[in-house]
Interface confidence: low
């Protein structure tokens, strides 16, 4: 087989690769960096001009079972006087993550990777004004 | 581990917890959601705490491309379009799970990896520390 060019995303398949049935992939769910912690500024969800709350969703057939979702508290943004300014908008910021879904079909169990869209917080934006002719 | 409800009629030999290694179907559910934040919204430009998006590419990871946010300013943009340093732009960080090829370069063998990404920025009131 030809050796791939540098910068190419096609590698030789090492002979040491584990055998995997067609249509499947082997996934070790022992998480690398499991104990890594988020080091965000303190209480930014309540100090933000677009504050948000957190909700924990729990699903025993999902790994990880807990996924935290943020919800913006206001439609507008909080101004210097602590009042809601509806000339600005609080909007959600979202990020994809992967989860493993466990599916039961009768007594057999299968596993499926799933992309989940997580709302991680909110930001304050200038609204887009649509002018009607 | 995570306890899984089991059909009471199934044999007891089934493990209630997620096993350490699983065989996963290659088709990722919801895989076609938009992964490029520049295409999905322009919040990064319209925010009072705007950010730039930096492409982080790693062929040994899935997804191979992740976009990292970097706040453009220390302060926030005020109504006049100027930077107000009485407020702070701070990154919103999130732990996400990705797949890491293990062993390296193998096409269909992965391990879950937790990585920390900055997703965007938000404008906050600063914490003022008064020195006695």
């Amino acid at each position: 087989r030809k050796i791939p060019k540098v910068g190419h995303t096609f590698f030789q398949k090492p002979e040491s690769c584990p055998p995997v049935p067609g249509g499947s992939m082997k996934l070790d769910i022992g998480i690398i960096n499991e104990n890594q912690r988020v080091s965000m500024s303190r209480n930014i969800e309540s100090r933000s001009t677009s504050p948000w709350n957190y909700t924990v969703t729990w699903d025993p057939n999902r790994y990880p079972s807990e996924v935290v979702q943020a919800q913006c508290r206001n439609l507008g943004c909080i101004n210097a006087q602590g009042k809601e300014d509806i000339s600005m908008n609080s909007v959600p910021i979202q990020q994809e993550t992967l989860v493993v879904r466990r599916k039961h079909q009768g007594c057999s169990v299968s596993f499926q990777l799933e992309k989940v869209l997580v709302t991680v917080g909110c930001t304050c934006v200038t609204p887009v004004i649509h002018h009607v002719q | 581990g995570i306890t899984i409800p089991r059909n009471p009629g199934c044999p007891n030999s089934e493990d209630k917890n997620f096993p350490r290694t699983v065989m996963v179907n290659l088709n990722i559910h919801n895989r076609n959601t938009n992964t490029n934040p520049k295409r999905s919204s322009d919040y990064y430009n319209r925010s009072t705490s705007p950010w730039n998006l930096h492409r982080n590419e790693d062929p040994e990871r899935y997804p191979s491309v992740i976009w990292e946010a970097k706040c453009r300013h220390l302060g926030c943009i005020n109504a006049d379009g100027n930077v107000d340093y009485h407020m702070n732009s701070v990154p919103i960080q999130q732990e996400i799970l990705v797949l890491r090829r293990e062993p390296p370069h193998c096409p269909n063998s992965f391990r879950l990896e937790k990585i920390l990404v900055s997703v965007g920025c938000t404008c906050v009131t600063p914490i003022v520390h008064h020195v006695a």
């Epitope: 995303t9 096609f10 590698f11 | 990722i28 895989r31 096409p107």
Partner: nanobody
Framework: EVQLVESGGGLVQPGGSLRLSCAAS??????MGWLRQAPGKEREFVAA????????YYADSVKGRFTISRDNSKNTLYLQMNSLRPEDTAVYYC?????????????????WGQGTLVTVSS
């Protein structure tokens, strides 16, 4: 810029066979794949093949029935489809890749043909 043109689609009865072809012009790629989209559904991975033709990957739903192959001298990709089922009805697309990475993810394919319709019905 690579151009991809699929052909060989059509109406076939359940249990029948079809052979799809995809003619590539322009730059040749290490890997290519077939993906399909049924009405109202997401585009899904069917099969992929490395540049040399040594490595092939199949979706569970087509394994043992479909065979992907390529003829590099003709710059052509093929999909031999046997034992067709009604659920195989879809528009089939040929697409290029920078490698056999994440073959199952439609977002990882770079160039797409216009598609060829396969209808399996009695």
């Amino acid at each position: 810029e690579v151009q991809l043109v699929e052909s060989g689609g059509g109406l076939v009865q359940p249990g029948g066979s079809l052979r799809l072809s995809c003619a590539a012009s322009g730059r040749t790629y290490d890997a290519m794949g077939w993906l399909r989209q049924a009405p109202g559904k997401e585009r899904e991975f069917v099969a992929a093949i490395s540049g040399s033709g040594d490595d092939t990957y199949y979706a569970d739903s087509v394994k043992g029935r479909f065979t992907i192959s390529r003829d590099n001298s003709k710059n052509t990709l093929y999909l031999q489809m046997n034992s067709l089922r009604p659920e195989d009805t879809a528009v089939y697309y040929c697409a290029t890749r920078r490698g056999l990475y994440y073959v199952w993810d439609a977002n990882d394919y770079e160039n797409w043909g216009q598609g060829t319709l396969v209808t399996v019905s009695s």
